[in-house]
């Protein structure tokens, strides 16, 4: 049989500090004993556990030095096969800062948003955007990439975007958020930070919020990774909903849940094409939504909300390669 690698992708991404397993299997015809082994090219290999028909490469607490080419070599007698996997290590902690931390409606005209301790910082991998309500503001005035002061061997970057704001002088200014998104093979992660808009310097709290402190919101897509926990004392943070994906017959099932103790509920608030297009089920701290994969499948933001509290979780789904509709 062929040499099988799990996951089957030729490029696999793992977050810095995270763990990943690569499994390579081979079965030989004629009941011959296969030999399977992972080899590292130009990279530290990690822990390898091999038996007759399989070899498991485990990367724990991944550092940037774990990135590189990993080759699984399998043989049946004198037939040798090999598969190559490129392991990417990325860093994308929930460390967004904004300046100013709160805006004064008639006064502040410029805002900066910085994603700290990230890698890579290429335009295709990391995007920063400023959202006014649900509208993305246009081009940034400037975008800078700087090295973070080095801690250990891993070289990380801070990426800053600066935007000129339109007039926010309305009775209820729309919500302002900075969003950073990391897109890598099989991974799309977003962090979001709210920027409170104050009506005047004496009004310390924006309408409709309990505190001018920015609240990060997290979203992740097409990812087998769990985003790193927010920096700082996470137990002091408000409870947040999370969205999980699992395959289901004919598509995906999304589960929004909040492990916050009794008295909370979650519900879906947004889906591409409108919520009415989906089957939903809500039960207290859990809410399910079925995503069909007919044709290309839906593409866009799914969002759920926690009550009380109003914290949101968002997930961006990318349309898969289109499959032709079934014949009538």
């Amino acid at each position: 049989g062929p040499l099988e690698v799990e996951p089957p992708d030729s490029v696999v991404a793992v977050s810095m500090g995270g763990s990943r397993q690569l499994t390579c299997r081979l079965s030989c015809a004629d009941h011959r004993a296969p030999s399977v082994q992972w080899r590292g090219l130009d990279t530290s290999l990690g822990a390898v556990r091999s038996d007759a028909g399989s070899s498991v490469l485990s990367v724990h607490n991944a550092s940037l030095s774990a990135a590189g080419t990993h080759v699984c070599v399998g043989s049946c007698g004198n037939l040798t096969l090999q598969r190559t996997v490129q392991l990417l290590v990325f860093a994308f902690p929930d460390q967004l800062t904004v300046s100013p931390v709160a805006l004064v409606a008639k006064q502040d005209r410029e805002v900066a948003c910085t994603a700290h301790n990230v890698t890579p910082a290429s335009p295709e991998a990391l995007s920063l955007s400023l959202l006014l309500g649900d509208r993305e503001l246009g081009e940034a005035l400037s975008r800078e990439v700087e090295e973070e002061p080095q801690q250990g061997e891993d070289l990380l970057f801070q990426v800053t975007g600066r935007w000129l704001l339109p007039s926010l002088d309305t009775p209820t200014p729309p919500a302002l958020h900075c969003r950073a998104t990391m897109t890598l093979p099989g991974v799309q992660l977003s962090h979001q930070r709210a920027i409170p808009v104050l009506r005047s310097l004496t009004s310390r709290e924006p309408p409709g919020t309990t505190s001018p402190e920015a609240t990060p919101e997290l979203s992740s897509t097409r990812s087998s990774e769990s985003p790193a926990p927010p920096a700082g004392n996470s137990s002091a943070r408000p409870c947040r909903p999370k969205i999980h994906q699992s395959p289901a017959a004919g598509g995906l099932e999304l589960l929004c849940e909040a492990a916050c103790g009794p008295g909370v509920a979650v519900g879906w608030t947004q889906a591409p094409g409108g919520l009415e297009a989906y089957q939903r089920r809500e039960a207290g701290a859990q809410a399910w939504l079925s995503v069909p994969r007919a044709g290309c499948g839906p593409e866009g933001w799914f969002q759920c909300r926690l009550d009380p509290g109003g914290q949101m979780a968002s997930l961006y789904l990318v349309a898969e390669v289109c499959s032709p509709p079934a014949p009538p």
Epitope: S122, S129, G161
Partner: antibody, heavy 121, light 107 residues
Framework: EVQLLESGGGLVQPGGSLRLSCAAS????????MTWVRQAPGKGLEWVST????????YYADSVKGRFTISRDSPKNTLYLQMNSLRAEDTAVYYC??????????????WGQGTLVTVSS | DIQMTQSPSSLSASVGDRVTITCRAS??????LNWYQQKPGKAPKVLIF???SLQSGVPSRFSGSGSGTDFTLTISSLQPEDFATYYC?????????FGQGTRLEIR
């Protein structure tokens, strides 16, 4: 099949302006980072500008910053490069390139055929 | 900016030869290195991305290796259609930069 088709090139005087267009078909346009790359006659490839899938994040080479603007019109599946204050050294074939949606930093998988911009008096 | 330096700048070889082109980055770019092939009057074509991943449809005689700052593109057995110019490119941090190119000619 993905196709990128550039247009808008031509002869322009130094200090003049041109707008290049790149019409895309066959790819999830509003999810694909897109890029302009140029190649001066007989020279190598030079990256010019990239815009993120949503268009909210844009990057420019220092050589064009402040003079060129990349933008996209998602309903029209079209990428643009507005080039102002053109100089003789901007003379090149300009390629538009796109990556597949699911690979954050894969290279530019799809390329147009290029459009020639000549800046000369 | 990260400088990408290719060597050699040009190379003569025969059909069936094994050819290696090297690319050196002025600082570490981890695994964010891609290789392109360009023929006269045509747009570049992706051969290899993330150091060693072969682009769909590219023959297996092309392979890539390396990490950090030093990378190589190897063509195991040259075919007539492989005579072209080859570029490496980093997209680790902006600005994205290309090598100056290696022109592969028929001996």
């Amino acid at each position: 099949e993905v196709q990128l088709l550039e247009s808008g090139g031509g002869l322009v005087q130094p200090g003049g302006s041109l707008r290049l267009s790149c019409a895309a078909s066959g790819l999830t346009f509003n999810n694909s980072a897109m890029t302009w790359v140029r190649q001066a006659p007989g020279k190598g490839l030079e990256w010019v500008s990239t815009t993120s899938g949503s268009g909210g994040t844009t990057y420019y080479a220092d050589s064009v910053k402040g003079r060129f603007t990349i933008s996209r019109d998602s309903p029209k599946n079209t990428l643009y490069l507005q080039m102002n204050s053109l100089r003789a050294e901007d003379t090149a074939v300009y390629y538009c390139a796109a990556r597949g949606y699911s690979y954050g930093t894969t290279p530019y998988e799809y390329w147009g055929q290029g459009t020639l911009v000549t800046v000369s008096s | 900016d990260i400088q990408m330096t290719q060597s050699p700048s040009s190379l003569s070889a025969s059909v069936g030869d094994r050819v290696t082109i090297t690319c050196r980055a002025s600082r570490s770019i981890s695994s964010y290195l891609n290789w392109y092939q360009q023929k006269p009057g045509k747009a570049p074509k992706v051969l290899i991305f993330f150091v060693s991943s072969l682009q769909s449809g590219v023959p297996s005689r092309f392979s890539g290796s390396g990490s950090g700052t030093d990378f190589t593109l190897t063509i195991s057995s040259l075919q007539p259609e492989d005579f072209a110019t080859y570029y490496c490119q980093q997209n680790y941090i902006p600005p994205i930069t290309f090598g100056q190119g290696t022109r592969l000619e028929i001996r």
